[in-house]
């Protein structure tokens, strides 16, 4: 139903959705400071701008009683919930900040008529994706479909001379809700990666996954995977690896490679990292300090996403424009804004583009390196070490398929 | 419009050292692999060397890995190589050029001409 | 390494003509990359990925090849084409150039 939104006469309102369920276990008193940090920045931002405004944020919590697994799966309805308590309350902002889960944002943006905006620190999944009024400032699935398919024809670079048309895909039910979507998007018959890729295998039990390690009729010798190194050498452990072998390990929303005394342990020599370039300023700012590497992103996309709201209302309002307007609602796309820690690109549909980083373990120095970086906005790949020292035979990543010979050009689709 | 500009001729007697200079401008400086190339008179181009300027990373051609020294000053946009010990065959224009991958070398700086003589 | 081995090293050419000039890698490659260079001049990048033309390039130019022999051609020769022509690889570490094809008006 049509809910009057408290956004006009010089005071402008965030409703800020706290739910039980989240896309990471982040205490909500930690969204609340981030938020809250935001708040201070736009005031400052609008005040600069000779706009003499209110802005302020409500946090909407849901019913602990009903909603209290923390776990994403089980989310569907407690977003149409607090719309439901918003609605009898009468009491909606301008702007919808939360929910995370991809479950939750997808029911809600089903089940409301959604003139206003959306943003979300999450919805990962591509069923979220192409939608008209929601924003996204975590990386979706597809930004990271993209970046491997990409990667995956390749072969004009001195370290990798194939294209690959094949992957494993291991997927075991118990990953975190980010890695959940992003393996559920590979694992989609009718995704952009399955369509490009000739053989994709999923594979769901450990022992599938450790068997395949020295597997002499193995059908792909690269594996895609999500999680930090920890996860991987749970799976792995130190069992002997085939010397052909590539493991991608999706670990996006981790800091932790950057850091100055991290040693890559020997368990990472045969894996390529795909992570996100690290923000500079975030390890000192206050809503962060309390924060692990993994958790910065997070409570940053709620920060960022009070900041998109003042830099639109800042436009809309120098424009003499109306902000409870459909126009309103379908603006917070193809745009930069200043962010926390920098500018943050938006794609044609909302989402956050960023640059990707793909690392190796130098055999030399037992470092993480960068290998190459990945503009999603522009779907461009960056080289960076041109000569690095792999595990892998001749500094070159092997082919995907073992003994196809010196056939360079291969094309599967 | 990119451009590359390089620092003036030198000339150097035997075992001295030159440094190199090869400012950039019309892109971002920290977007683009630069890489260092040496023609010699009469002799083919020959690859030197390549730095990333933002994560600062630096491969070298095996055979001028203890001729050259590569480095940069990203807040000047501006890279750099040092050629130590120098001898008669290390007289030749030398290049920078930008990677635009998958254009690698697509532009290059005018050259800088290093004499070395007694 | 891979040596590239460009020929002929000399190409004297009437306007109007094609132009043809071959490279011949040490072992395979997937592409090659070609460069122009003129008296005085630094080069520029004229090909790239063995087929695509760099920005500005005109259309008379062309390139092909695949494995370890790669050509470029010039269907009709035009004065301003008079210069010497490398081809490169960066298949390999590290990338090597060809000793050059010099193309002059007859």
């Known amino acids: 139903s049509q809910v009057s939104q408290n956004c006009h006469n010089g005071s402008y309102e965030i409703s800020v959705l706290m739910m039980g369920n989240s896309a990471f276990a982040e205490p909500l008193k930690n969204l609340e400071d981030a938020v809250n940090e935001g708040l201070e920045i736009v005031r400052g931002r609008l005040q600069n701008a000779g706009l003499n405004v209110t802005v302020n944020a409500t946090f909407m919590y849901s019913d602990g009683l009903i909603h209290n697994s923390g776990d994403c799966r089980s989310s569907t309805c407690e977003g149409l919930d607090l719309l439901r308590k918003i609605s009898n309350a009468q009491r909606m902002g301008c702007v919808l900040i939360g929910p995370s889960c991809t479950y939750s944002t997808f029911q809600m943006y089903l089940d409301t008529e959604l003139s206003y905006p959306m943003i979300s620190a999450g919805s990962f999944g591509l069923s979220c994706d192409y939608k008209e009024t929601l924003t996204r400032l975590m990386s979706p699935a597809r930004k990271l479909m993209y970046f491997l398919v990409n990667f995956w024809k390749t072969n004009d670079l001195p370290f990798k001379t194939y294209s690959w048309s094949t992957s494993y895909v291991y997927k075991n039910g118990t990953e975190t809700e980010d890695c959940f979507w992003y393996l559920n998007a590979l694992e989609a018959s009718v995704s952009y990666f399955s369509h490009e890729l000739g053989f994709k295998v999923v594979l769901r039990q450990d022992k599938e996954f450790q068997d395949i390690l020295m597997d002499h009729n193995r059908k792909s010798n690269v594996i895609i995977m999500c999680g930090g190194p920890e996860f991987l050498y749970k799976l792995k452990g130190d069992r002997a690896v085939a010397e052909d072998i590539v493991i991608i390990l999706v670990d996006l929303f981790n800091d932790q490679y950057f850091e100055d005394n991290v040693t890559a342990p020997d368990y990472m020599k045969n894996v390529l990292v795909l992570t996100l370039s690290p923000g500079n300023s975030l390890l000192n700012s206050s809503f962060s300090r309390n924060l692990s590497p993994t958790k910065r992103d997070f409570a940053l996309a709620y920060l960022n996403g009070i900041l998109l709201f003042g830099h639109m209302l800042k436009i809309f309002l120098e424009n003499g424009e109306n902000i409870t307007t459909p126009k309103f609602a379908h603006a917070f796309r193809n745009l930069t804004f200043e962010g926390y820690d920098g500018p943050v690109t938006l794609d044609d549909w909302g989402d956050v583009d960023s640059t990707m980083v793909l690392l190796y373990t130098s055999v030399d120095t037992k470092k993480y390196k960068v290998l190459l970086t990945y503009d999603t906005h522009v779907n461009k790949t960056y080289p960076v070490d041109m000569s690095p020292t792999f595990t892998w035979k001749n500094s070159k990543l092997p082919n995907d398929i073992t003994g196809r010979g010196p056939q360079h050009h291969h094309h599967h689709h | 419009e990119v451009q590359l500009v390089q620092s003036g001729a030198e000339v150097k007697k035997p075992g001295a050292s030159v440094k190199v200079s090869c400012k950039a401008s019309?892109?971002?400086?920290?977007?683009?692999?630069m890489n260092w190339v040496k023609q010699a008179p009469g002799q083919r181009l020959e690859w030197m060397g390549v730095m990333n300027p933002k994560f600062g990373t630096i491969n070298y051609n095996q055979k001028f890995k203890d001729k050259a020294t590569i480095t940069r000053d990203t807040s000047a946009s501006t890279a750099y190589m040092e050629l130590s010990s120098l001898r008669s065959e290390d007289t030749a224009v030398y290049y920078c050029a930008r990677d635009d991958y998958p254009n690698y070398f697509d532009y290059w700086g005018q050259g800088t001409t290093v004499t070395v003589s007694s | 390494e891979i040596v590239l081995t460009q020929s002929p090293d000399f190409q004297s050419v009437t306007p109007g003509e094609k132009v043809t000039i071959t490279c011949s890698a040490s072992?395979?490659?997937?592409?090659m990359y070609w460069y122009q260079q003129k008296p005085d001049q630094s080069p520029k990048s004229w090909i790239y990925r063995t087929s695509n033309l760099a920005s500005g390039v005109p259309s008379r130019f062309s390139g092909s090849g695949s494995g370890t022999d790669f050509t470029l051609t010039i269907s009709s020769l035009e004065a301003e084409d008079a210069a010497t022509y490398y081809c490169q690889q960066y298949h390999d570490y590290p990338p090597t150039f060809g000793g050059g094809t010099k193309v002059e008006i007859k």
């Open positions: 072992s395979s490659v997937n592409y």
């Open positions: 019309g892109y971002t400086f920290t977007d683009h692999n």
